[in-house]
Interface confidence: medium
C-alpha cells in the first residue's frame, strides 16, 4: 500500500516515562518508515477513575486500524491502555474515546506547550 491521502510526516511527541527512558518529555517527532508503508500518529493514555494519564504520543508504523482516520479516536470499551491513531501531521494533538459499543464521547484537549523538535 502506498502513502495515504493525508501523508504523515510529523506527530506530536510525548513520553510520560521520559526520565527513566532518557528521552525528551514532549515535542514534535519526524516520522520515518519504509518507502511502501504508511505512517501514522498515535496517542496512548490510561483513565484512572476519570483522571486521564497520558502515556505516550508519537509516530506509528503502517497499521490498517489507522488508515484514512483524520482524528485520533479510541474505540475499545474499557482497555488497560487507551490507544488511538490517525493520518495527517499532528493529528494526535487531540484524542477522543468513543466506544464502538456505545457510550459517551470524551475528547481530551492538550494543554498549550512550547514544542521541541525531535529527530
Amino acid at each position: 500500500s502506498g502513502r495515504g491521502e493525508a501523508e504523515t510526516r510529523e506527530c506530536i511527541y510525548y513520553n510520560a516515562n521520559w526520565e527513566l527512558e532518557r528521552t525528551n518529555q514532549s515535542g514534535l517527532e519526524r516520522c520515518e518508515g519504509e518507502q511502501d508503508k504508511r505512517l501514522h500518529c498515535y496517542a496512548s493514555w490510561r483513565n484512572s477513575s476519570g483522571t486521564i494519564e497520558l502515556v505516550k504520543k508519537g509516530c506509528w508504523l503502517d497499521d490498517f486500524n489507522c488508515y484514512d482516520r483524520q482524528e485520533c479516536v479510541a474505540t475499545e470499551e474499557n482497555p488497560q491502555v487507551y490507544f488511538c491513531c490517525c493520518e495527517g501531521n499532528f493529528c494526535n494533538e487531540r484524542f477522543t474515546h468513543l466506544p464502538e459499543a456505545g457510550g459517551p464521547e470524551v475528547t481530551y484537549e492538550p494543554p498549550p506547550t512550547a514544542p521541541t523538535l525531535l529527530t
Epitope: 488508515y67 475499545e76 491502555v81 464502538e100
Partner: antibody
Framework: EVQLLESGGGLVQPGGSLRLSCAAS????????MTWVRQAPGKGLEWVSV????????YYADSVKGRFTISRDNSKNTLYLQMNSLRAEDTAVYYC???????????WGQGTTVTVSS | DIQMTQSPSSVSASVGDRVTITCRAS??????LAWYQQKPGKAPKLLIY???SLQSGVPSRFSGSGSGTDFTLTISSLQPEDFATYYC?????????FGGGTKVEIK
C-alpha cells in the same frame, strides 16, 4: 469467561489444504483484532496473520503470504485460517489469540495441531 | 522486518534466585513490547505489555523495563511455577515478531 477454542487441525499431504476455526466467547468479538500464531515442534513462536475487528484489514507473515487467508464471521464469533499449498514447514501448533496490537495478545486458545506430511 | 534477539537462550536457576532476560530489537520500537510465559504443552500467557506494565493477575515478582531497542524481563524471586520459556514480542510494526525464547530451567 473469555475463551478461544481452535479446531480443524489434522494430518494433510504437502500441497493440500486445511481450514482452521477459532470460536470466541465471553467478549465483544467484533471489537477486537484477532491473530494467528504458530509454533513448530520444539521451536519458538511465529506470528502468522492478523485481521481487524471489522474484517476489513489483514496482514500476513511473508512465509504464508499468498497461501493463507485469514477471515472472520462476526455473526458467528468465529475466526478462520484457510491454508492452501501446505508445506512440511507449516507443521505446527496453531493458536488463535485476541488482543489489541499495543498490548499484545491477552487471550489465547489451547491450540490445534497441523501436520503436513506424505 | 524488525528482528528480536533474546538472551540467554536458556538459564539454570534455583528457587528464590533473581533472573534477568534481555531482548534487543533491530530498530527502535519505543516501549511497544510484550513478554509472554509458556509452559510445555500450553498456550503462551501475557505477562507484561508496553514494556513495563504488568498484565492483570500476574504476580508482582515479574517486572519489565526498557525502551527503544533494549528491554529486560526480571523475575525478582524465582518460584517453582516460573520454570518455563519466556518470549518477547514487538508490537510496533507488522509483522509482530517474537524473540527466540529463553528457557528458565531448574539448576
Amino acid at each position: 469467561e473469555v475463551q478461544l477454542l481452535e479446531s480443524g487441525g489434522g494430518l494433510v499431504q504437502p500441497g493440500g489444504s486445511l481450514r482452521l476455526s477459532c470460536a470466541a466467547s465471553g467478549f465483544t468479538f467484533g471489537s477486537y483484532g484477532m491473530t494467528w500464531v504458530r509454533q513448530a515442534p520444539g521451536k519458538g513462536l511465529e506470528w502468522v496473520s492478523v485481521i481487524s475487528g471489522s474484517g476489513g484489514g489483514t496482514y500476513y507473515a511473508d512465509s504464508v503470504k499468498g497461501r493463507f487467508t485469514i477471515s472472520r464471521d462476526n455473526s458467528k464469533n468465529t475466526l478462520y485460517l484457510q491454508m492452501n499449498s501446505l508445506r512440511a514447514e507449516d507443521t505446527a501448533v496453531y493458536y488463535c489469540a485476541k488482543g489489541p496490537r499495543i498490548v499484545g495478545m491477552d487471550v489465547w486458545g489451547q491450540g490445534t495441531t497441523v501436520t503436513v506430511s506424505s | 522486518d524488525i528482528q528480536m534477539t533474546q538472551s540467554p537462550s536458556s538459564v539454570s536457576a534455583s528457587v528464590g534466585d533473581r533472573v534477568t532476560i534481555t531482548c534487543r530489537a533491530s530498530q527502535g520500537i519505543s516501549s511497544w513490547l510484550a513478554w509472554y510465559q509458556q509452559k510445555p504443552g500450553k498456550a503462551p500467557k501475557l505477562l507484561i505489555y508496553a514494556a513495563s506494565s504488568l498484565q492483570s493477575g500476574v504476580p508482582s515478582r515479574f517486572s519489565g523495563s526498557g525502551s527503544g531497542t533494549d528491554f529486560t524481563l526480571t523475575i525478582s524471586s524465582l518460584q517453582p511455577e516460573d520454570f518455563a520459556t519466556y518470549y518477547c514480542q514487538q508490537v510496533f510494526s507488522y509483522p509482530l515478531t517474537f524473540g527466540g525464547g529463553t528457557k528458565v530451567e531448574i539448576k
